[in-house]
Interface confidence: low
């Protein structure tokens, strides 16, 4: 398994963010596919569950992310994004997400860095 | 407006150290980690590591382990690249750069020249 | 580590042709980003994720391509787009950078 992501994202304060995540696998795509999302906080801090995806969706039932995650992907077409709503600074920080097709070999995980921003996006500066 | 201003030239010999600046400003300097990368004459670009200015985590460039040290200030918003036991293969510019969604805001470079 | 070759090593067009820049990379990436560098600058990026366009940058560039073969396009070159174009990867630990284009005045 092949994971793809970019590199980082900026999302403003308050607004969702999409999670982008694809993946190649040289195995069919069915019932054995698992997807996890994890955080991981900028300041360090402990690694916290975001996400879990195996033939259903299943969302956090406790923590920061609960009830503020939802499944935005289609395994059928190779994605395994999320949709993170409601942003918070305490947001920043990388998300890893980690696809597992047996009986293809487990990939590297991919990351994300999520920069939640004030409402000015540094995509709207130019450049210097 | 972001700006990431660097320390200016420097000349070594072989064996010494060097420590190069990067002070940032413009935008919260702890969103977002501070990549240095290092461009040798005439050569291309080659990422030496990164570092989260948040905790001081630090993630390497395999080829650039143990005489390379990154580090940050957080309270002057400036970021550091100290290089130790210099050779001459070291002479480059060495950029700091901060990677956002769509652009990157690099410093204007810093030439390290290490000559006996 | 990735590896990213970039051909040809120095194209020699005339202002107002179209140039086509390629980066092939040695095993599959996500995604391209590419950069711009004129001598005694900082490189300048142009195209992140493949095919956006950093701000400001002109619609004569766009970028294309997946797997391991990625491709910057200048559709009519202007006199202030000869410089070296870089690629780079960020699919893998670390990020790497091809060697450069030179694109130089024919």
């Known amino acids: 398994v092949e994971i793809y992501t970019s590199r980082v994202l900026e999302a403003v304060n308050g607004t969702d963010a999409r999670l982008k995540c694809t993946f190649s696998s040289f195995a069919p795509v069915g019932d054995a596919l698992t997807v996890t999302w994890n955080f991981r906080p900028l300041d360090g801090g402990p690694e916290q569950f975001v996400f879990y995806y195996h033939i259903d969706p299943f969302q956090p039932m406790s923590g920061r992310f609960k009830d503020r995650v939802s499944w935005d992907g289609n395994p059928e077409r190779y994605d395994a994004s999320i949709l993170l709503w409601k942003l918070q600074f305490d947001d920043n920080g990388t998300y890893t997400c980690q696809v597992k097709n047996p009986p293809d070999v487990d990939g590297v995980i991919g990351e994300i860095r999520l920069s939640v921003v004030h409402t000015v996006r540094f995509s709207e500066i130019h450049f210097l | 407006q972001v700006q990431l201003v660097q320390s200016g030239s420097e000349l070594k010999k072989p064996g010494a150290s060097v420590k190069v600046s990067c002070k940032a400003s413009g935008y919260t300097f702890t969103n977002y980690w501070m990549h240095w990368v290092r461009q040798a004459p005439g050569q291309g670009l080659e990422w030496i590591g990164e570092?989260?200015?948040?905790?001081?985590?630090?993630d390497y460039n395999e080829g650039f382990t143990g005489r390379f040290v990154l580090s940050v200030d957080k309270s002057s918003s400036t970021a550091y690249l100290q290089i130790s036991s210099l050779k001459a293969e070291d002479t480059a510019v060495y950029y700091c750069?901060?990677?956002?969604?769509?652009?990157?805001?690099w410093g204007q470079g810093t030439l390290v020249t290490v000559s006996s | 580590e990735i590896v990213l070759t970039q051909s040809p090593a120095t194209l020699s067009l005339s202002p107002g042709e179209r140039a086509t820049l390629s980066c092939r990379a040695s095993?599959?990436?996500?995604?391209m980003y590419w950069y711009q560098q004129k001598p005694g600058q900082a490189p300048r990026p142009l195209i992140y994720v493949t095919s956006n366009r950093a701000t400001g940058i002109p619609a004569r560039f766009s970028g294309s391509g997946s797997g391991t073969d990625y491709t910057l396009t200048i559709s009519s070159l202007e006199p202030e787009d000869f410089a070296v174009y870089y690629c780079?990867?960020?699919?893998?630990?670390?990020?790497?950078f091809g060697q450069g284009t030179k694109l130089e005045i024919k």
């Open positions: 095993s599959s990436v996500g995604y």
């Open positions: 570092i989260n200015p948040t905790n001081g985590g630090t």
């Open positions: 750069t901060i990677y956002t969604t769509a652009l990157d805001y």
């Open positions: 780079q990867q960020w699919s893998s630990n670390p990020p790497t």
